[in-house]
């Protein structure tokens, strides 16, 4: 805390400008009106304040808005956002996607901090669901965002938002998350034709049940081995040799290189040797 001291004569700030960088901490406290600061927050970012000076400015805003900052101030926080604690952010009510983008921009290139995680949580809860625009924004800044959500949180993602998801956004998702996302993707892409549908659904297939894989095997999709290896074990095991051959198409030869890995290893064990031999790959059950 900065002590309350009278502002020296002639030092009272009329506006937020570069002259303030020469003010000592106590002078900033005494000479900068909090209401002026709040209305001219957009100027703060252009001024090279020290971290100590930013602490004073934050303190002034905290005093002015003990219940939490209004969105008009939040949108222009800029680097002052980095001074906020998750406890501060929990008091906010952020509803504008532009505000969210402005604050995410400040943290760009860094890991998701507890502050950013709290901000996103507040924003999404305020909206009630992860709509497409929000998901688009979040995955642009944090490709792993979707996979950082629990299956329960993912259940609030509407199928329409799935169109915003890129394959790399699902890289770190685990099977429980894909179990939630796959039915949404299936719904979202249901009106697409065979080959286009497969291109879109491919990243989500780690959540697909056996019957959907059987259906895909009838559509000449030529699934690559990387996708096959991410399928659920319980979905792969009931597939016949013929179905796997149709599902993989020319990629079926890749099974040999994966024969010691799950789920291929367990699938091989379940097959009759005569059936495996029809593949001509030397797979041993």
């Amino acid at each position: 805390e900065v002590e309350k001291t009278a502002c020296p004569s002639g030092k009272k700030a009329r506006e937020i400008d570069e002259s303030l960088i020469f003010y000592k901490k106590w002078e900033l406290e005494a000479c900068v009106d909090a209401a002026l600061l709040a209305t001219q927050m957009d100027r703060v970012n252009a001024i090279p304040f020290t971290y100590e000076q930013l602490d004073v400015l934050k303190h002034k805003l905290d005093e002015l808005y003990p219940q939490g900052y209004p969105e008009s101030v939040i949108q222009h926080l800029g680097y002052l956002f980095l001074k906020m604690s998750p406890e501060d952010i929990r008091k906010w009510n952020v509803t504008s996607l532009e505000t969210l983008k402005a604050l995410l921009e400040v943290n760009k290139g860094h890991e998701m901090s507890p502050q950013v995680a709290t901000l996103i949580d507040r924003f999404v809860k305020g909206r009630g669901q992860l709509d497409k625009d929000t998901l688009d924004t979040l995955t642009a800044f944090y490709p792993g965002y979707l996979c950082s959500l629990s299956p329960e949180e993912l259940s609030s993602v509407p199928p329409s938002s799935i169109w915003a998801v890129r394959p790399q956004d699902l890289d770190t998702c685990d099977p429980r998350q894909l179990d939630v996302l796959y039915p949404k993707a299936r719904l979202a892409f249901q009106n697409m034709n065979g080959s286009e549908y497969f291109v879109k659904i491919q990243s989500f297939l780690g959540g697909a049940p056996t019957e959907d894989l059987k259906a895909l095997s009838q559509q000449n999709v030529s699934m690559d081995l990387a996708t096959f290896m991410k399928l659920r074990t319980d979905a792969v095991l009931p597939l016949t040799v013929a179905e796997v051959q149709k599902l993989l198409g020319p990629h079926v030869e890749g099974l040999k290189a994966e024969e010691r890995h799950r789920p291929v290893r367990d699938w091989i064990l379940r097959q009759r040797q005569d059936d495996l031999d029809t593949l001509g790959l030397g797979l041993q059950g």
């Epitope: 685990d174 099977p175 290896m229 991410k230 074990t233 010691r260 890995h261 290893r265 064990l269």
Partner: antibody
Framework: QVQLQESGPGLVKPSETLSLTCTVS??????????WSWIRQPPGKGLEWIGY???????NYNPSLKSRVTISVDTSKNQFSLKLSSVTAADTAVYYC???????????WGQGTMVTVSS | DIQMTQSPSSLSASVGDRVTITCRAS??????LNWYQQKPGKAPKLLIY???SLQSGVPSRFSGSGSGTDFTLTISSLQPEDFATYYC?????????FGGGTKVEIK
């Protein structure tokens, strides 16, 4: 529910063959969803997987032990067995049999049996 | 063979603490990662399978996360019965390797 019980000698002489049997009760070794494994733990050390067998007779062994290990299954007795040849003091350990469910992991274990290799 | 590296090898914690153990695979193992708990003189017990799925009967304070090469076991609020050694294990590759273990002791 399924239970596993190891049996076999607790003392084996160096250069001889260690033989253990695991009896499965409350379930079947012929389950299509399960592999039957042997795992060991030297005193004060971590876990080392030895190998598994499927009801069909297919086996898979730890590469570091492969030349000395044989695992077999007897579906009529609902048992599977481990043979480890040319043992040395380094093979002294608690030996566990375990069920490896292909959807989960080693979900059921025997209580373990201590085998000491000493002359 | 795939190597599994656990850290830390031991840790001291108090009842109520949040405890995190990490496991790193020498190559990608997708989500094929299991966690076991072992108490002295007892057989290991399966806690988490497929990186994040809780085994039936295991308290919800245990959770797992991760995919590819980096995985985490978290105990949200350590209980007296949780003091034990924890092992990760990969069933992805046929070499079925275990991590070296993490001993959780009372502070």
């Amino acid at each position: 529910q399924v239970q596993l019980q190891e049996s076999g000698p607790g003392l084996v002489k160096p250069s001889e063959t260690l033989s253990l049997t695991c009896t499965v009760s409350g379930g079947s070794v012929s389950s299509r969803d399960d592999l039957w494994s042997w795992i060991r733990q030297p005193p004060g050390k971590g876990l080392e997987w030895i190998g598994y067998i499927y009801y069909s007779g297919s086996t898979n062994y730890n590469p570091s032990l492969k030349s000395r290990v044989t695992i077999s299954v007897d579906t009529s007795k609902n048992q599977f067995s481990l043979k480890l040849s040319s043992v040395t003091a380094a093979d002294t350990a608690v030996y566990y049999c375990a069920r490896d469910n292909v959807f989960t992991g080693f979900d059921i274990w025997g209580q373990g049996t201590m085998v000491t290799v000493s002359s | 063979d795939i190597q599994m590296t656990q850290s830390p090898s031991s840790l001291s914690a108090s009842v109520g603490d949040r405890v995190t153990i990490t496991c790193r695979a020498s190559q990608s193992i997708s989500s094929y990662l299991n966690w076991y708990q072992q108490k002295p003189g007892k057989a290991p017990k399966l806690l988490i399978y497929a990186a994040s799925s809780l085994q039936s009967g295991v308290p919800s304070r245990f959770s797992g996360s991760g995919s590819g090469t980096d995985f985490t076991l978290t105990i949200s609020s350590l209980q007296p019965e949780d003091f034990a050694t924890y092992y990760c294990q990969q069933p992805y590759d046929a070499s079925y390797t275990f991590g070296g273990g993490t001993k959780v002791e009372i502070k």
